[in-house]
């Protein structure tokens, strides 16, 4: 009794593919040095029709050799998952019936090298090149299997992708589209205006494709992507015009269009009546000479920061600007100030601004309940990390400009709405984290006694915002509690 | 009794694919130096119709060879997960039924090398190129299998919620849809408008989950 789909029908995707993709993602950098070796392994073992099981069986076995590489535990864990998961799942899917699998010890050296070098001399990189290719092939082969075994309602009709949308922050760039596939799969291609098409995310059932490693090659180029739709289980079959259906994306110029990520205040230092505030220079995925460039490296003087600052005791804000990552501002002696920064690219006409950084304040003494609030913030960060890989499109009531006299009311709304995230994620660790956070927050709130606030907005009167903005505003209000605890 | 989905129904995506994707992500840079090697493994082992299991079985086994490379522990852990997970999951899916699995010690050398050189001589880069390709092939092959394992089950029309409407874009299994409060009503804070098309394992019948939504004036 082998229910591949299991309880909610996503076993393969949620385990094996996640590991494969994480491995491949961690190997993004590998490739440019691989000298396009033709590995014989892939000549002899091909994920061909009726041979997918055998290919995957061999590839999974091959993967095990890499487990003894001196790599990080995380990487090994994924390799183990892909290798073992493939082997297990193969038994379940029956794709290798009647085949005699290959013996396990055999390796896959390259043709040219095998003629004249001992393996010990071979660069580590070459192993990684092979490993990356092996992972890619395993992924492709699984995709091929999993597309092919779905029962169809007697039709190979495909639907063209639509609503192709670029989602890009600090050059991390993902193409998203609709619809969720039913009996079809997608492959994405990307090119510059003058370049060749490069295929990515082969035969995927996802409705997004990470194109970061393509666009970071030249962020000032304009890119176009297209999404091909294929019938599940019959990727060779084409549309009526003799080629698969596809839809083009809007053009995308990363330098002009990537969203600016939320900045972070790295430090502030007071000397007399001057305070020096430093903004963290965030690393991007853009590379030059084998190093990742920072946001400032990429944008230079095109990027400016706006600082908002105010006395902890009042709400009247002041502002300053810099085209470096440092501000030097005048403050009143003996006063504590709070700071928030925003990144801006003045030369742009859209996507000019980032969201505001979390608020940082001077002289935050550890009050009795400050520790609780600090833990609430770390729980919120944890929730933010956990939901990143999920597609929760909920909008939540969010108070983004909390007046100090309404902070308890606002906090209660945040705590209520947090439960929606818990409900919709269906994830045990999110559920536990939310539960823990609510307990911590309620403990701290009860320490204020029964505060009655009047003239404050009901939760339902607040603006609904996406989860990211909701969590950012939540962090802001917690900072407010920290500053006054 | 092989419940691939595991306890929380996301076993494959959250374990195997996560590892595959993490490995591939860490190998992003690998490729441009790979000189478009045509690895024989992928010529001999193809994730073809009705052969997906064997391909994955071999690919998982092949992955194990990389565990001995001098890479980071993190990388190895993912490799181990992909290799072992594939093996385990293959047993579960029945994709290798009736096949004689390979003996554990056998590796997959390329044609020319196996004739005259030991594996030790092979450049590490080349191995990585191969590994990356192997992971990609395993991932694709799994996708191919797993897309085919569930017949197209759909949900009936969703239940009605007081003062709310729903426009269903897809009745397919695992579709997530939202109710919208009628004009003049707002979602009560703390309630969710989400409903999901899920499968009742006992009856094998799909149904929409009950939303916690309350619409208030």
């Amino acid at each position: 009794d082998c229910d591949i789909e299991g309880k909610d029908g996503k076993q393969y995707e949620s385990v094996l593919m996640v590991s494969i993709d994480q491995l491949l993602d961690s190997m993004k950098e590998i490739g440019s040095n691989c000298l396009n070796n033709e590995f014989n392994f892939f000549k002899r073992h091909i994920c061909d029709a009726n041979k997918e099981g055998m290919f995957l069986f061999r590839a999974a076995r091959k993967l095990r050799q890499f487990l003894k590489m001196n790599s990080t535990g995380d990487f090994d864990l994924h390799l183990l998952k892909v290798s073992e998961g493939t082997t297990i799942l193969l038994n379940c899917t029956g794709q290798v019936k009647g085949r005699k699998p290959a013996a396990l010890g055999e390796a896959q050296p390259t043709k040219s090298l095998e003629e004249n070098k001992s393996l010990k001399e071979q660069k580590k990189l070459n192993d990684l090149c092979f490993l990356k290719r092996l992972l890619q092939e395993i992924k492709t082969c699984w995709n091929k299997i999993l597309m092919g075994t779905k029962e169809h309602s007697g039709t190979t009709n495909t639907v063209a992708a639509y609503n192709l949308t670029w989602k890009s922050t600090n050059f991390k760039t993902i193409l998203e589209w609709e619809p969720k596939p039913v009996n079809q799969v997608y492959t994405v291609q990307i090119s510059t205006k003058s370049g060749d098409w490069k295929s990515k995310c082969f035969y995927t059932t996802d409705t997004e494709c990470d194109l970061t490693d393509e666009i970071v090659k030249d962020v000032k180029q304009t890119y176009l992507a297209r999404v091909f739709s294929y019938p599940a289980g019959n990727v060779e079959s084409t549309g009526s015009a003799g080629e698969p259906l596809y839809e083009n994306s809007p053009e995308f110029t990363p330098y002009l269009e990537t969203n600016l990520g939320q900045p972070t205040i790295q430090s502030f230092e007071q000397v007399g009546t001057k305070v020096n505030v430093t903004v963290e220079d965030e690393r991007t995925l853009v590379r030059r000479n084998n190093t990742f460039l920072s946001l400032r490296d990429v944008f230079g003087k095109d990027l400016i920061y706006t600082l908002y600052y105010w006395k902890s005791s009042s709400s009247g804000k002041k502002t300053a600007k810099t085209n470096t990552n440092e501000f030097l501002i005048d403050v009143d002696k003996g006063e504590n100030y709070c700071f928030s920064v925003q990144a801006v690219i003045p030369s742009r006409t859209v996507n000019r601004k980032s969201t505001d950084s979390p608020v940082e304040c001077m002289g935050q003494e550890k009050g009795e309940f400050r520790e609780n609030w600090v833990n609430v913030i770390s729980d919120l960060k944890k929730i933010e990390d956990l939901i990143q890989s999920m597609h929760i499109d909920a909008t939540l009531y969010t108070e983004s400009d909390v007046h100090p006299s309404c902070k308890v009311t606002a906090m209660k709304c945040f705590l209520l709405e947090l439960q929606v995230i818990s409900l919709e994620s269906g994830d045990a660790s999110i559920h536990d984290t939310v539960e823990n956070l609510i307990i911590l927050a309620n403990n701290s709130l009860s320490s204020n006694g029964n505060v009655t606030e009047s003239g404050c907005k009901e939760c339902e009167e607040l603006e609904e915002k996406n989860i990211k903005e909701f969590l950012q505003s939540f962090v802001h209000i917690v900072q407010m509690f920290i500053n006054t605890s | 009794d092989c419940d691939i989905e595991g306890k929380d129904g996301k076993q494959y995506e959250s374990v195997l694919m996560v590892s595959i994707d993490q490995l591939l992500d860490s190998m992003k840079e690998i490729g441009s130096n790979c000189l478009n090697n045509e690895f024989n493994f992928f010529k001999r082992h193809i994730c073809d119709a009705n052969k997906e299991g064997m391909f994955l079985f071999r690919a998982a086994r092949k992955l194990r060879q990389f565990l001995k490379m001098n890479s980071t522990g993190d990388f190895d852990l993912h490799l181990l997960k992909v290799s072992e997970g594939t093996t385990i999951l293959l047993n579960c899916t029945g994709q290798v039924k009736g096949r004689k699995p390979a003996a554990l010690g056998e590796a997959q050398p390329t044609k020319s090398l196996e004739e005259n050189k030991s594996l030790k001589e092979q450049k590490k880069l080349n191995d990585l190129c191969f590994l990356k390709r192997l992971l990609q092939e395993i991932k694709t092959c799994w996708n191919k299998i797993l897309m085919g394992t569930k017949e197209h089950i759909t949900c009936p029309p969703p239940m009605s919620v007081e003062h709310a409407d729903i426009w269903v874009k897809s009745y397919s299994l695992y579709s997530r849809e939202r109710y919208i409060c009628n004009s003049g009503f707002k979602r009560k804070a703390g309630t969710s408008s989400l409903t999901e098309c899920v499968l009742n394992k006992a009856t094998n019948v799909a149904h929409w989950t009950t939303p916690s939504l309350k619409c208030i004036r």
Epitope: A320, P346, N351 | -
Partner: antibody, heavy 117, light 107 residues
Framework: QIQLVQSGGEVKKPGASVRVSCKAS????????VYWVRQSPGKGLEWIGY????????IYDQNFKGKATLTVDKSTSTAYMELSSLRSEDTAVYFC??????????WGQGTTVTVSS | DIQMTQSPASLSASVGDRVTITCLAS??????LAWYLQKPGKSPQLLIY???NLADGVPSRFSGSGSGTDFSFTISSLQPEDFATYYC?????????FGQGTKLEIK
């Protein structure tokens, strides 16, 4: 093309309030701050404050705190300035302008507010 | 607050003349300075931003220079339409103060 169109002139009695609007078109409203500037008869330009439609943050000159309140309506791409407790010295032309971070590149045509008993 | 001192307050010149107006900041503002022109009954119009950059559509006879605390604005050859009031503004830190203006009149 980019335009900032302000509401018409107003005559008010001392102690009253007035709301001046500034409707923006031809650009992404939330991407640019809206500045407000006063020019009293025969005088120079005085900066009142600005609002960032993206996050709702307002910054005021100390002299206008409590006098001016800046708001926006993102759905109509309109910025508003409310002046309260009007006095004769508030008689002036009030301008809104679009801030490109390094300067004010587009200005409204100005709204004359006259405070007279 | 940063004070902006503009000089001269008024200036008479003829068509074809070269004229320079200066603006002094009470503390360093790097190059966060803009220059505007205003004609009677009209809205101000941006001429120079970031101390030295010519705004779109502004004739090249206008130029700006300086950084830190000392700035100047020059019209290389006065045209009849250039007779107006000119303002500098610092956009470095709030309040974003203007200079008191320089009225340029026909001699």
């Amino acid at each position: 093309q980019i335009q900032l169109v302000q509401s018409g002139g107003e005559v008010k009695k001392p102690g009253a309030s007035v709301r001046v609007s500034c409707k923006a078109s031809g650009y992404s409203f939330t991407d640019y701050n809206v500045y407000w500037v006063r020019q009293s008869p025969g005088k120079g330009l005085e900066w009142i404050g600005y609002i960032d439609p993206y996050n709702g943050i307002t910054i005021y000159d100390q002299n206008f705190k409590g006098k001016a309140t800046l708001t926006v309506d993102k759905s109509t791409s309109t910025a508003y300035m409310e002046l309260s407790s009007l006095r004769s010295e508030d008689t002036a032309v009030y301008f809104c302008a679009r801030d490109v971070t390094t300067a004010l590149d587009f200005w409204g045509q100005g709204t004359t507010v006259t405070v007279s008993s | 607050d940063i004070q902006m001192t503009q000089s001269p307050a008024s200036l008479s010149a003829s068509v074809g003349d070269r004229v320079t107006i200066t603006c002094l900041a009470s503390q360093t503002i790097d190059t966060w300075l803009a220059w505007y022109l205003q004609k009677p009954g009209k809205s101000p119009q941006l001429l120079i931003y970031a101390a030295t950059n010519l705004a779109d559509g502004v004739p090249s006879r206008f130029s700006g220079s300086g950084s830190g605390t000392d700035f100047s604005f020059t019209i290389s050859s006065l045209q009849p339409e250039d007779f107006a009031t000119y303002y500098c503004q610092q956009v470095y830190s709030s309040p974003f103060t203007f200079g008191q203006g320089t009225k340029l009149e026909i001699k």
